[in-house]
Amino acid sequence: AGVFELQIHSFGPGPGPGAPRSPCSARLPCRLFFRVCLKPGLSEEAAESPCALGAALSARGPVYTEQPGAPAPDLPLPDGLLQVPFRDAWPGTFSFIIETWREELGDQIGGPAWSLLARVAGRRRLAAGGPWARDIQRAGAWELRFSYRARCEPPAVGTACTRLCRPRSAPSRCGPGLRPCAPLEDECEAPLVCRAGCSPEHGFCEQPGECRCLEGWTGPLCTVPVSTSSCLSPRGPSSATTGCLVPGPGPCDGNPCANGGSCSETPRSFECTCPRGFYGLRCEVSGVTCADGPCFNGGLCVGGADPDSAYICHCPPGFQGSNCEKRVDRCSLQPCRNGGLCLDLGHALRCRCRAGFAGPRCEHDLDDCAGRACANGGTCVEGGGAHRCSCALGFGGRDCRERADPCAARPCAHGGRCYAHFSGLVCACAPGYMGARCEFPVHPDGASALPAA
């Protein structure tokens, strides 16, 4: 058992021309969230088993509103990792699909609207317990930068999280620096130490002292990107400067970019500009193909005829979308208006309306004065998303249909007595007070304390 962890570093327009506009606008603020789906990489049943290793959904990111005229920046991301727990062995090779979703927060009827912005997929080799692996993927004009790792949950250990190690009651049986390992009580296990200098980012080991490279890296310590080498022969010891005696191959020599990508040198390494349909650090990832298992929910994947559609998913009943990601039922057509909840009763659909709405489709706005009659001369007043009747004197209730007791609210101040009257109420004031509601004290000299004009 263990956890696959995905950290999204950035999502925004990729380099090069055709950079997309921000997915949010001043009129339609939005926020991002991510979904990751994992499948065993070489599993034959991967096509039929959607997200067989698990899936996770991120939290929603901060709300973003486009600044008019500003270039589309990297978009604000949700906090935290996406974590996909796995119960069985970590397969070592896995396929992933990472989707970037946009939640529009405009005035959609029925709440926010979701749309898929980008989807990337790939197959990777990864040992559990190894360091974070970094990746860059492009989907159309968007670029997603992320890191991922798989780690075992105690007591599981090993590159597949299949061995169980737990402290024993008598750990002294093992020498210093060693720990006892179950299921064999008499076996002592050394903490795994890779070859000295093995790259913590690009290498890992399954046996002590070895250094195995993650995909895309080579060299004894996994520090050399595939197809590149920094120098053929170093300068002699007398040389004060570093560099190459014979101009060695530059980072682009031998073109590390696959699938017709073009290479350009950068201060630290190289960068590939990929042809349409390919992306990744070395253009090694083709769009998404059936090999990536992109069809969810048991969809059948068929290779597409042209580069723009590398695959087509034939969805099983009840699902649709380019990757069979959308559950389709009779409520999918959104028969309920104004945010009503659709319930499929089998023989019919029913709408459960939000407060303030009614009708079979929640189409009637109860908070709307249109067509709303206030009885007994009352007038309808809208405000705050609700309506109310402002009733004529002597009437009350939601629709002014109830005869009001004008004295119920004790309107006469300073102990005045209230009498209901056909035109409203009359206050009989206590000695020393006057006014329609007995609100003004009468001074001993006979003057009243009326407010100044």
Epitope: I109, G110, P317, G318, Q320, V328, D329, R330, S332, L333, Q334, P335, R337, G346, H347, A348, L349, R350, C351, P360, R361
Partner: antibody, heavy 120, light 107 residues
């Protein structure tokens, strides 16, 4: 009286697109979904897709995915079905048919049909 | 997709006969099906919804029954205007699917 009146017959070349209209009257247009169904000569009826005229939400038969587009003009009480990349096997009579959006009545009223002929 | 298998594909009957047409769905559809009538050169017309309910204006000689995956349309006493092709349709699940039709001809 409920009526669905469709546009006239069309003759198109392979690869072209066709847009068929269906004007509704006699009921509240946005209270009923609009289905589109076709019938090729001597063949069974085939469902293309459905649209909720109130919200514009659509669901398509995966067989027509990417080729059929359903839209509505609420102000004109009219539904449209556009089929692109026409092939000879798209030669058929195309029908619109309304369906109650809640009680799920089967398609009770149908348009008179629009014959689309695809021929080079 | 749910397959709708209709039988017979055609039948000959006389005015006054009792006619039964059956439709079998490849999986249970909980009554979410209907029957349509189509005359040559005309659009289909709804007859029955939810397996057993008559659409407005449909004569009571038409009736529907069934549950699960098996449904029946019965015309108790065939009239001259009933000679047509009848289709079943399921709307339990997208995509909606139709039976192959039963042509009712005059004997």
């Amino acid at each position: 009286e409920v009526q669905l009146v469709q546009s006239g017959a069309e003759v198109k070349k392979p690869g072209a697109s066709v847009k068929v209209s269906c004007k509704a009257s006699g009921y509240t247009f946005t209270d009923y979904y609009m289905n589109w169904v076709r019938q090729a000569p001597g063949q069974r009826l085939e469902w293309i897709g459905i649209i909720n005229p109130y919200s514009g939400v659509t669901i398509y038969n995966h067989k027509f995915k990417g080729r059929a587009t359903l839209t509505v003009d609420k102000s004109a009480n009219t539904a449209y079905m556009e089929l692109s990349s026409l092939r000879s096997e798209d030669t058929a009579v195309y029908y619109c048919a309304r369906q109650d959006s809640l009680l799920d009545y089967a398609m009770d009223y149908w348009g008179q049909g629009t014959t689309v002929t695809v021929s080079s | 997709d749910i397959q709708m298998t209709q039988s017979p594909s055609s039948l000959s009957a006389s005015v006054g006969d009792r006619v039964t047409i059956t439709c079998h769905a490849s999986q249970g559809i909980s009554g979410n099906m209907g029957w349509l009538q189509q005359k040559p050169g005309k659009a289909p017309k709804g007859l029955i919804y939810h397996g057993a309910n008559l659409e407005d204006g449909v004569p009571s000689r038409f009736s529907g029954s069934g549950s699960g995956a098996d449904y029946t349309l019965t015309i108790s006493s065939l009239q001259p205007e009933d000679f047509a092709t009848y289709y079943c349709v399921q709307y339990a699940q997208f995509p909606y699917t139709f039976g192959g039709g039963t042509k009712v001809e005059i004997k």
